[in-house]
């Protein structure tokens, strides 16, 4: 049952009214409108779309809609000097060249400004040398190569398949291994689901399709030239040599037709096991270099992309709260795309548009939310979450004092199997309660709740009868709000069946084939999954903005803290002798978690029983709930990652997309057995345990009775 109150209006303006106003047909129309031409960050087309969205949000009834601009570092291919990779013979002649563009899909042949596939922020360069195949280029793949197989990547060009981890981590790993260049490719094992046709006849990746994407390692910094501060007119900008997170070696992506030509000649060591072999008809030899007959041939990269400071535009819409206008609930998703953005981001942007329209309709009828709702259309997400991060940097003082929650709204779908939610534990109960009230769109679940189909298809690994909710990682616009500012955050989308579809992301991700037709023909012809995602995202925003008492349950944080403490203890216990030698103990952390659990339980009792008609008391209790996430922020940040400040969660150091719990301790323990100074290494483990202990205890104390 919704806990929201009606403000300034009759009780009919409740959650049901808001949800009923959301229409699949509108989302479909908006998606079509947003996907007819490319909207690459920093281009005129994307500026025009920003102005269109501004205009429409005003028409929908928001109180104000502003464009906020920033001048940030972006990266583009050189239009007259294209990027490509060649195989050269001993005379230096190019005997094979990779394609210069993706063949455009039918109906889009005459569209201008389709950016060719490139790795954004790659430096220029023309390295040549032998090739080494490095599987997914994960940390463990390089361990296997260097430690077990004794293969040295120094001075080599490495070729890695996309998937499993964020591409920026692959490039960082290759740099650390001494590679002089990186070739990224999409293997059919990861991007071609068996039994499905290639686009345009199905949703699989054709051989000429290529995944674009940035290869930064920003660690939450935002614009590489202005870390920590907004990239405005008076900002001090670093020189390019001091910029944050830029790769130091050339990188370029290719499709599997071109990859076949490079990989089929590979010689050297055989692949270590089947987990290193994809689905191409090639041996998947590791190298280095080509096999006997081709051993004199080399690979050469030709990369001429440029990085330039470019203006970007966010659209920020405001629906002022009637009772607590200084409390902000934010719904944000990006607008910029690599090409047409059929799924990423416009399936999300279309949902945001319809959510704004529904809220606007209620507002025109005299309703207002209790708290202020901010709507955001972020720019330059694809270039490193730049629009959202710059705006949050500019408004950080307001956000840290007033930010209640952030709900992310990138791609609404990455499949059509079941719901996928990642969020702070504070929102678990909100999500469970909301999905119990929504109807499932899934076949075979007619008349059943979304909660029921979600639980059936994606069960929690720990608790029977409940669905899985994952940790927040990064790779999307919630990052600055959650990882840097400590604002409770969540995201929801429809996803694939991870059990049967092992490929990474969806096959056409960041390719030219990510079109409106892809969605309308193959993923969601009735737009029923989009509608469900709109209901989940919109419903969360409605409850967060309108509930008298914030719909956060601190007891769920207690449960996960115990789970994460158990996990990190178990990892540490791999080294029982060192724990004894260096007197490493987790007792303090377990004690702090126990204290948190007891205090959270008592807080929940007080929350249930207090006089909700007392506005001072109500505000006080809500502030304790709002500021709980903030209490997990360490102002000093994580080691070498100052903008990742959340002590309980951070993006994994080995995969930006994944979340890691107690990341400070985890990173201190990682590969500790190979550290040259074990005493120092275990000292750092102890330091991180003490930071985690202090933070959990301090957070617990924010929930104690105020006086």
């Amino acid at each position: 049952k919704s806990s929201s109150e009606a403000t300034n209006i009759t009780p009919k303006h409740n959650m049901k009214a808001f949800l009923d106003e959301l229409k699949a047909e509108n989302i479909k129309k908006f998606l079509h409108n947003f996907t007819q031409i490319p909207h690459l960050a920093g281009t005129e087309q994307n500026f025009q779309l920003a102005k269109q969205i501004q205009s429409q949000w005003k028409e929908f009834g928001l109180d104000s809609v502003e464009l906020t601009h920033y001048d940030v570092l972006l990266s583009y291919p050189n239009k007259t000097h294209p990027n490509y990779i060649s195989i050269i013979n001993e005379d230096g002649n190019e005997i094979f060249n990779t394609s210069l563009f993706e063949p455009p899909p039918a109906g889009y042949e005459n569209v201008s400004d389709i950016v060719p596939p490139f790795s954004a922020f790659s430096p220029q360069g023309m390295p040549e040398g032998d090739l080494v195949y490095v599987n997914y280029a994960r940390t463990e793949d390089f361990f296997k190569l260097e430690r077990d197989m004794k293969i040295n990547c120094s001075g080599k060009i490495v070729i890695a398949r996309y998937g499993k981890v964020f591409r920026g981590n692959k490039v960082k790993n290759a740099q650390l291994a001494g590679a002089t260049g990186v070739i990224l490719y999409s293997d059919p094992a990861d991007y071609f689901a068996p039994g499905v046709k290639s686009y345009p006849d199905g949703w699989n990746l054709p051989g000429g399709g290529v995944q674009r994407g940035n290869i930064l390692n920003l660690n939450g910094a935002g614009d590489p030239l202005t870390p920590g501060y907004p990239a405005n007119e008076y900002a001090y900008r670093r020189g390019i040599a001091e910029a944050v997170g830029l790769p130091s070696i050339p990188v370029h992506p290719i499709g599997y037709y071109d990859a076949q030509k490079l990989l089929e000649k590979m010689g050297g060591s055989a692949s270590p096991d089947s987990s290193w072999r994809g689905s191409l008809k090639v041996p998947y030899n590791v190298g280095p270099g080509f096999t006997g007959n081709f051993s004199t041939q080399k690979v050469k990269m030709h990369i001429h992309s440029t990085s330039e400071v470019t203006r970007i535009y966010n659209v920020i819409g405001t629906l002022r709260g009637a009772v607590e206008p200084d409390r902000y609930v934010i719904l944000g998703g990006h607008r910029d795309s690599w090409v047409f953005g059929g799924i990423d981001p416009q399936s999300g942007a279309a949902v945001v548009h319809e959510i704004v329209r529904s809220f606007g309709t209620l507002k025109k009828e005299g309703w207002r939310p209790r708290r202020t709702i901010l709507f955001a259309s972020w720019d330059a997400e694809e270039f490193g979450l730049l629009g959202s991060t710059e705006w949050a940097e500019e408004n950080s003082r307001l956000l840290q004092e007033r930010g209640v929650a952030y709900i992310n709204a990138d791609s609404s779908i990455e499949g059509n199997y079941t719901l996928r939610v990642d969020c702070t534990p504070l929102m678990y109960s909100l999500v469970y309660n909301l999905t119990k009230e929504l109807e499932s769109p899934d076949e075979g679940f007619e008349g059943k709740s979304l909660y029921e189909s979600w639980t059936k298809k994606s069960p929690s690994p720990e608790f029977s009868g409940m669905p899985r909710i994952s940790k927040l990682g990064s790779g999307n616009d919630f990052e600055v709000f959650f990882q840097r500012l400590g604002i409770a955050s969540g995201r929801a989308r429809y996803t694939k069946n991870w059990e049967t579809n092992k490929f990474s992301s969806y096959p056409l991700y960041h390719s030219v084939y990510e079109t409106y037709e892809l969605v309308e023909k193959f993923y969601d012809p009735m737009f029923k999954y989009h509608l469900t995602v709109a209901q989940v995202r919109g419903g969360m925003v409605f409850e967060l903005a309108n509930s008298v008492v914030l719909p956060f349950d601190c007891r769920d944080y207690a449960v996960v803290l115990r789970k994460y403490a158990d996990k990190i203890y178990n990892i540490s216990m791999k080294h029982p002798q060192e724990m004894k030698t260096y007197s490493v103990s987790f007792d303090s952390l377990f004690s702090a978690v126990k204290n948190f659990t007891e205090i959270a339980s008592k807080f929940s009792e007080r929350l249930r029983d207090f006089d909700k008609s007392n506005p001072i008391l109500l505000r006080m209790m809500n502030d304790q709930l709002m500021f709980l996430e903030r209490a997990f922020i360490d102002p000093l940040g994580l080691p070498d990652r100052p903008f990742y400040r959340h002590v309980i969660y951070a993006p994994s150091s080995h995969n930006k997309y994944a979340g890691e719990s107690f990341p400070g301790i985890y990173d201190a323990l990682f590969d500790i057995e190979s550290k040259v100074d074990p005493s120092q290494a275990w000292g750092e483990v102890k330091r991180q345990i003490s930071i985690a202990t202090f933070t959990v205890q301090a957070a617990a104390e924010t929930l104690s009775e105020v006086a």
Partner: antibody, heavy 118, light 111 residues
Framework: EVQLVQSGAEVKKPGESLKISCKAS????????IGWVRQMPGKGLELMGI????????RYSPSFQGQVTISADKSINTAYLQWSSLKASDTAMYYC???????????WGQGILVTVSS | QSALTQPPSASGSPGQSVTISCTGT?????????VSWYQQHPGKAPKLMIY???KRPSGVPDRFSGSKSGNTASLTVSGLQAEDEADYYC??????????FGTGTKVTVLG
Amino acid sequence: EVQLVQSGAEVKKPGESLKISCKASGYSFTTYWIGWVRQMPGKGLELMGIIYPYDSDTRYSPSFQGQVTISADKSINTAYLQWSSLKASDTAMYYCARITGGYLFDYWGQGILVTVSS
Amino acid sequence: QSALTQPPSASGSPGQSVTISCTGTSSDVGGYNYVSWYQQHPGKAPKLMIYEVTKRPSGVPDRFSGSKSGNTASLTVSGLQAEDEADYYCTSYAGSNKYVFGTGTKVTVLG
């Protein structure tokens, strides 16, 4: 009381697959490494590899890498050693052992005699 | 990693002492104080006798003792008894979760 109980003796033909087990009890299975040790007839002890059941982190001795697979199921406190294609030279006694602080093998299973013969 | 070198056999009369050597390198025996010794009777599983070079688990008679000098560790059985007749193996930690076993020594109690 800490115990490691191994499955029974096996007689197999060359080329067949085999999975032998080691069930632990009396301690927290997930937080101790388990090692598998081979002893060929009349020969000494050879460490094949070790596994940490909590996250199935597995390390193989170089001469056994790619020859066998070590795994664990923490839900039933059991470690496994398996072959996809046995050879006559795999005939041996196989022990599982718990590894504890001080890098010592403090508890051992009773051993499994595997005989591979055509 | 090569196996640690032990003498194939050693013997002594009841009541006498016998010492078994275990020679490795600076990467294993010489580099760590994590040498352990195991006793194995025919048809039985090995049993821990000494750990961390010199320490004895409870239940192991005090006539078993260990020591180390440089890259060589030693196990001494003083006051030899008939039940001490068995195979003895040393093992050493070699860093990064690597372990090296000795070649084994057959101890015979004469008489």
